[in-house]
Interface confidence: medium
Amino acid sequence: NLGLDCDEHSSESRCCRYPLTVDFEAFGWDWIIAPKRYKANYCSGQCEYMFMQKYPHTHLVQQANPRGSAGPCCTPTKMSPINMLYFNDKQQIIYGKIPGMVVDRCGCS
Amino acid sequence: NLGLDCDEHSSESRCCRYPLTVDFEAFGWDWIIAPKRYKANYCSGQCEYMFMQKYPHTHLVQQANPRGSAGPCCTPTKMSPINMLYFNDKQQIIYGKIPGMVVDRCGCS
């Protein structure tokens, strides 16, 4: 299950991965030294019945339909880290791998 | 981040894990031999700003607020498998570990 990739010109209404560049300078996040911006991507779109479901569980909850379950939503199903240079809480400048920064794939869960 | 656990009597409105027993017999899924039912759990509730976010990315997308991003939703952030005995598509009886069957933790992503 590779997920769908879209862009701002796509007519796709279903769950899809879209490009997004996050700009730390624009946020005023001056504790991040590098990168100043990076390609993060994001997930958006509708989760139709059985479409792009990562887990069997998603379908089972749809079948069971318990109180308060809102149905699956379009969310990251595969993410990757990036290397960053940043101030830690001791005000040391650290080079480190930060997990969960890039969306590689979107799906319904 | 251990997530929240709730039950049907809880007044919690935020993203939480609720108990759910999936009953394969009730679904009429006769190709599943065992278990006939199991504790699957599910996720439900609101994702307030910065609450229970699994990934830094979730907060970054909220900051960037791109077109069509619906905000984070309450979804499984940790899942586990169960062992099952079932008929496969060749009508062989298989004993296997099926991933993504139990919600261990819920969060906002």
Epitope: T21, K36, I82, L85, Y95 | -
Partner: antibody, heavy 125, light 107 residues
Framework: EVQLVQLGPGLVKPSETLSLTCTVS??????????WGWIRQPPGKGLEWIGT???????YYNPSLKSRVTISVDTSKNQFSLKLSSVTAADTAVYYC?????????????????WGQGTTVTVSS | AIQMTQSPSSLSASVGDRVTITCRAS??????LGWYQQKPGKAPKRLIY???SLQSGVPSRFSGSGSGTEFSLTLSSLQPEDFATYFC?????????FGQGTKVEIK
């Protein structure tokens, strides 16, 4: 291909300020993936990182030199400069400028590549 | 600041020899280490990044290994052009710090 060319005097008197510039060619100093640094090497010794700057003017200095160092960027001239005040004989060294490259995918970083040709600075009266 | 202790400070070897240089960090730096070669009167050139990844264009006789606090650079078969000074660089915590260098001379 980015190249760095250094300019500055080879002799500085004690207690004066050492000034060097590094001109960037083959690329923009304002590229958001580039950071610009200075390193020095005293005679017969190892390398010492002095500091690094970003085109917006944000700078990071080696604490051992911080009180005496200023690194600045002139985007209009596509160059950056080093000023080291109150120099002594201990500041005699070959001074290098260099680029750090940070890929916006976040996967690939390249420290100190390329380098300038080096400037030998002697502190002596 | 993290101290980088490089050994030996110098060594004599012949063409074809296998040579290993080590670098020890005063604290854990994961694999955030590079190796540089410097020839007299020239700027250093990066050989290895991320402790063990070979820089594009660098001959495969150069290899790096290690993580945490112990690192090594190995030249599997020394060539005439490899006689130079080698430095390690840690880029885990500012200030970046270099080893004091190992001079590889012709025996």
């Amino acid at each position: 291909e980015v190249q760095l060319v250094q300019l500055g005097p080879g002799l500085v008197k004690p207690s004066e300020t050492l000034s060097l510039t590094c001109t960037v060619s083959g690329g923009s100093i304002s590229n958001s993936n580039y950071y610009w640094g200075w390193i020095r090497q005293p005679p017969g010794k190892g390398l010492e990182w002095i500091g690094t700057t970003y085109y917006s003017g944000t700078t990071y200095y080696n604490p051992s030199l911080k009180s005496r160092v200023t690194i600045s960027v002139d985007t209009s001239k596509n160059q950056f400069s080093l000023k080291l005040s109150s120099v002594t004989a201990a500041d005699t060294a070959v001074y290098y400028c260099a680029r750090d490259y940070y890929d916006s995918s976040g996967y690939y970083y390249n420290w100190f590549d390329p380098w300038g040709q080096g400037t030998t600075v002697t502190v002596s009266s | 600041a993290i101290q980088m202790t490089q050994s030996p400070s110098s060594l004599s070897a012949s063409v074809g020899d296998r040579v290993t240089i080590t670098c020890r960090a005063s604290q854990d730096i994961r694999n955030d280490l590079g190796w540089y070669q410097q020839k007299p009167g020239k700027a250093p050139k990066r050989l290895i990044y991320a402790a063990s990844s070979l820089q594009s264009g660098v001959p495969s006789r150069f290899s790096g290994s290690g993580s945490g606090t112990e690192f090594s650079l190995t030249l599997s078969s020394l060539q005439p052009e490899d006689f130079a000074t080698y430095f390690c660089l840690q880029h885990h915590i500012y200030p970046w710090t270099f080893g004091q260098g190992t001079k590889v001379e012709i025996k």
